[in-house]
C-alpha cells in the first residue's frame, strides 16, 4: 500500500481510558484520543492495534494522516469521520486490518481533502454502493479520492450471502460517478472471477491498477481503451489463459502502460499465436521472458517468447461419430 | 425469529473457569452481532462481550477485559464465553443476544435467549 507512514519523531500519547468514550465537547486543539499516539508536527494520528472498537471521536482537528490499523471496529457508520469543526485536512486515512465487515453509506462524508484511503484486510461483505460517493443521486459531488487500496477485502465463501462480490464493489466504484478522479486503484487478493465490462471505462484518471492475485480467467469483455493516462496494470497471479486481438491492440495504444503478467497458466495452443506475435515485437510487457506455459501439458514450462507457430497447434476436433470413449 | 438456547451455567469458585454456549437454531444473517449480557438480582441487564459473525470483531465491558473471551463458531451456529478468574461480583444469569449493531445497549438486540445461572461463591 502506498498510505504514508509517519516521520514524527515526537509522538504524545495520551493517558488510556475508556476507548469509545463519547466527548461532546469539540476537542481540544492539542488533545491526543485514548489509545492513540499524537504528533502535530507530522499531523498525524496512530492509533495501531489497540482494539478500538470506534472510530475515536476527540480527534486533533489539525490530523493529516490517521492510522487506524489493527482494531475492532466492525462497523463504519455514516459519517464516521464527521466531526465539528471538521477534519478539513485529513488526507491519508489506513483502516487496514480493522476487521471491518460493514462500511455504510456516507461513511467517509465531510473529509474534504481525503486522497488516500485503504480498506485493505477487512472482510467487507456489506460495503454499500453510496460508501464513496455519499449519496445516491446518480451524478454525486465529486470524491477528492486519488488512491483507493481494497486488497484483500472478500469475505469467506460462506459470507457472502448469495451476491456477486465483484458486483457489490464495482456498484461503490462506479456510484455516482464520483471517483472520476481516482488515479490509483488497487484490489488484489479479491478471488475476482471476472471484472465487470463497464468499471474501468467509468474511472478515466486511472494511472495505476492492480488486479492481481484474483482469479481473472478473460479480459475478452473489458475495455483499456479509455485509459489514456494508464502507467501500470497488475494482472500477475491471476487465471489467464491468453489475451485476443482485441486486449492486446487496446493495451499497446496506451502510450505509458506497463503490464505485468507473470504467473498466469497460460494455454499454448492455436489460440496463443497473436498473443506471441505480440510479445516478441512489444515493449509494455515487463519481464515478458519469464512468461511460460501451463497447458497443455506437452508444452508445459515453455517460455511464450520461445515459441512459434509450428508450436501453437489444436487438435482437431472429431466428429461425434468417430469419438471413442 | 431466532431461537439462542444458552448453557453452561453452574456454580464455581472464586479465581474458577466456565465456559458458556449460544447455539443459534439457524444462522441469523439479519443479526450481524452476537452478544453476552448479564443480570445480577436486583440489577439492570449489562452489556458484557459481542462478536460479529463475519469479521470476528469483539468487545469487552471494561470489567471483563483481560479474563473473560467471546468466540464463534460459524459451522455450528455457536457462540462461546470463556470466563477466567471469575469474582462474586461475576454471578448472574447470562443471556445471549442478536443484533444488526455493533453496539452495547440492551436496545441494539432483537433476540434473545432464556438465560443461564453462573454462581461465584466460595
Known amino acids: 500500500s502506498s498510505s504514508p507512514t509517519s516521520s514524527a519523531s515526537s509522538f504524545s500519547s495520551s493517558a488510556p481510558f475508556l476507548a469509545s468514550a463519547v466527548s461532546a465537547q469539540p476537542p481540544l486543539p492539542d488533545q491526543c484520543p485514548a489509545l492513540c499516539e499524537c504528533s502535530e508536527a507530522a499531523r498525524t494520528v496512530k492509533c495501531v492495534n489497540r482494539n478500538l472498537t470506534e472510530v475515536p471521536t476527540d480527534l486533533p482537528a489539525y490530523v493529516r494522516n490517521l492510522f487506524l490499523t489493527g482494531n475492532q471496529l466492525a462497523v463504519l457508520p455514516a459519517g464516521a469521520f464527521a466531526r465539528r469543526p471538521p477534519l478539513a485536512e485529513l488526507a491519508a486515512l489506513n483502516l487496514s486490518g480493522s476487521r471491518l465487515d460493514e462500511v455504510r453509506a456516507g461513511a467517509f462524508e465531510h473529509l474534504p481533502s481525503l486522497r488516500q484511503l485503504d480498506l485493505s484486510h477487512n472482510p467487507l461483505a456489506d460495503l454499500s454502493p453510496f460508501a464513496f460517493s455519499g449519496s445516491n443521486a446518480s451524478v454525486s459531488a465529486p470524491s477528492p479520492l486519488v488512491e483507493l487500496i481494497l486488497n484483500h477485502i472478500v469475505p469467506p465463501e460462506d459470507e457472502r450471502q448469495n451476491r456477486s462480490f465483484e458486483g457489490m464493489v464495482v456498484a461503490a466504484l462506479l456510484a455516482g460517478r464520483a471517483l472520476q478522479g481516482l488515479r490509483r486503484l488497487e484490489l488484489a487478493s479479491n478471488h475476482f472471477l471476472y471484472l465487470p465490462r463497464d468499471v474501468l471505462a467509468q474511472l478515466p484518471s486511472l494511472r495505476h491498477l492492480d488486479l492481481s492475485n484474483n482469479s481473472l480467467v478473460s479480459l475478452t469483455y473489458v475495455s483499456f481503451r479509455n485509459l489514456t493516462h494508464l502507467e501500470s496494470l497488475h494482472l500477475e497471479d491471476n487465471a489467464l489463459k491468453v489475451l485476443h486481438n482485441g486486449t492486446l491492440a487496446e493495451l499497446q495504444g496506451l502510450p505509458h502502460i506497463r503490464v505485468f503478467l507473470d504467473n498466469n497458466p497460460w494455454v499454448c495452443d492455436c489460440h496463443m499465436a497473436d498473443m506471441v506475435t505480440w510479445l516478441k515485437e512489444t515493449e509494455v510487457v515487463q519481464g515478458k521472458d519469464r512468461l511460460t506455459c501451463a497447458y497443455p501439458e506437452k508444452m508445459r514450462n515453455r517460455v511464450l517468447l520461445e515459441l512459434n507457430s509450428a508450436d501453437l497447434d489444436c487438435d482437431p476436433i472429431l466428429p461425434p461419430s468417430l469419438q471413442t470413449s | 425469529e431466532v431461537q439462542l438456547v444458552e448453557s453452561g451455567g453452574g456454580e464455581v469458585q472464586p479465581g474458577g473457569s466456565l465456559r458458556l454456549s449460544c447455539a443459534a437454531s439457524r444462522r441469523p444473517f439479519s443479526s450481524k452481532t452476537m452478544a453476552w449480557f448479564r443480570q445480577a438480582p436486583g440489577k439492570e441487564r449489562e452489556f458484557v462481550a459481542a462478536v460479529r459473525w463475519i469479521g470476528g470483531a469483539t468487545r469487552y465491558t471494561d470489567s471483563v477485559k483481560g479474563r473473560f473471551s467471546i468466540s464463534k463458531d460459524n459451522a455450528k451456529n455457536t457462540v462461546y464465553l470463556q470466563m477466567s478468574s471469575l469474582r462474586a461480583e461475576d454471578t448472574a444469569v447470562y443471556y445471549c443476544?442478536?443484533?444488526?449493531?455493533?453496539?452495547?445497549?440492551?436496545?441494539?438486540?432483537?433476540?434473545w435467549g432464556q438465560g443461564t445461572l453462573v454462581t461465584v461463591k466460595p
Open positions: 443476544a442478536a443484533g444488526q449493531a455493533w453496539g452495547t445497549k440492551f436496545t441494539d438486540y432483537s433476540d
